[in-house]
């Protein structure tokens, strides 16, 4: 079998979602000794980074500028040493918000509710549009999608503490293209006051380990890099 | 707001050699990266060879070994220097710019641009 190097971590710098016109940022972190990075796009190759020197740096980062629907799609990326490739990165689905309007969200009954009471978020957008998404602040990358003509429903069920937080939807023209965000739905949930006080509120910033952790080596960098990509690979 | 305008096409003989040159207008140009792609009649416009900000390159590989990019800032201009060419190089070709860029990446994709010439005609043919 053809021999290959170990995949390399693929990410988008701050948010996968990516207002039309903004600059996307895909990290992609492989190896030291890289002379070479490739960011596929949809398979095909999207654009090369040779880091200089390659020794010193562990990855790179690819810039994505006036992001629009025909950059939205999913991307991978691959690393080569010397004559050898690595395997393919897994893929990252980067996608184009802030097209055509903004949808309203509302939730039932309100939003101040009691632990164990059923909620139901509701998305509406009136232009042509089938699939709904609705995601947290702070969790952005549990999406949740409903379908609908010009509305979709969210049931929460029995809702929790642990539901407390931020809500925003977007109507999606395709899995890679959706509109403004609305504006956020603010979750009370309240419970016992031995639950409230031990569930913990969610951060405020966004996907906190959406950030390209690329190092340049020094000599005591090299097993602190090891230790950070095993730690990343434990985490995901 | 990129202009971009080729210049240097024509009828050559195979074997022959041609220089392709993209004038681009604005201040931008130092930041941009820079490629030109080709399309032949009734087929898909293809990537030809790219230029990062730093200068690196990257070429089709239907075209490496012949043809050259180069760029210079000063001159706010791109090149192509093509030589022992090809009855399948026929196409008009098409210089592009990815505007601005931050990195030293090479752009091969045609989405990535987003600014792009009118395209000048290379013909090759005894």
């Known amino acids: 079998p053809k021999q290959t190097l170990p995949k390399p971590i693929i990410r988008a710098e701050s948010t996968y979602m990516v207002p039309k016109e903004k600059q996307a940022t895909l990290c992609c972190q492989g190896s030291y000794g890289a002379v070479e990075y490739q960011l596929h796009f949809e398979g095909s190759l999207f654009a090369v980074e040779r880091p200089k020197p390659p020794e010193r740096i562990n990855g790179v980062k690819f810039h994505i500028p006036d992001m629009n629907s025909r950059k939205a799609g999913r991307y991978s990326c691959i690393y080569r040493v010397g004559e050898l490739w690595s395997e393919r990165s897994d893929l990252l689905d980067l996608v184009v918000t802030e097209m055509y309007d903004t949808p309203t969200l509302s939730v039932h009954p309100g939003p101040e509710v009691t632990s164990g009471e059923k909620v139901t978020f509701y998305c509406r957008l009136d232009t042509a549009t089938s699939m709904f998404l609705l995601l947290k602040e702070g969790r952005s990358r549990d999406v949740q999608r409903s379908y609908g003509k010009v509305q979709a429903e969210f049931p929460m069920g029995p809702v929790t503490t642990a539901h407390r937080g931020s809500y925003r939807c977007f109507g999606s023209y395709n899995n890679y293209a959706w509109s403004f965000p609305s504006e956020p739905v603010k979750l009370l949930v309240t419970g016992d006051i031995e639950n409230t006080s031990l569930a913990p509120t969610d951060p405020t910033f966004p996907d906190s380990w959406d950030t390209c952790l690329l190092t340049r080596e020094t000599g005591l960098q090299k097993d602190l890099a090891l230790w950070d990509h095993t730690a990343q690979n434990l985490l995901r | 707001e990129v202009q971009l305008v080729e210049s240097g096409g024509g009828e050559v003989q195979p074997g022959g050699s041609l220089r392709l040159s993209c004038a681009a207008s604005?201040?931008?140009?130092?930041?941009?990266?820079m490629g030109w792609f080709r399309q032949a009649p009734g087929k898909e416009r293809e990537f030809v060879a790219a230029i990062s900000r730093s200068d690196d390159t990257y070429y089709a590989e239907s075209v490496k070994g012949r043809f050259t990019i180069s760029r210079d800032n000063a001159k706010n201009t791109v090149y192509l220097q093509m030589s022992s060419l090809r009855a399948e190089d026929t196409a008009v070709y098409y210089c592009?710019?990815?505007?601005?860029?931050?990195?030293?990446?090479?752009?091969?994709?045609?989405?990535?641009?987003?600014?792009w010439g009118q395209g000048t005609l290379v013909t090759v043919k005894p």
């Open positions: 592009a710019a990815v505007v601005p860029t931050y990195g030293s990446s090479i752009y091969v994709h045609s989405a990535a641009y987003n600014y």
């Open positions: 604005g201040r931008t140009f130092a930041s941009a990266a």
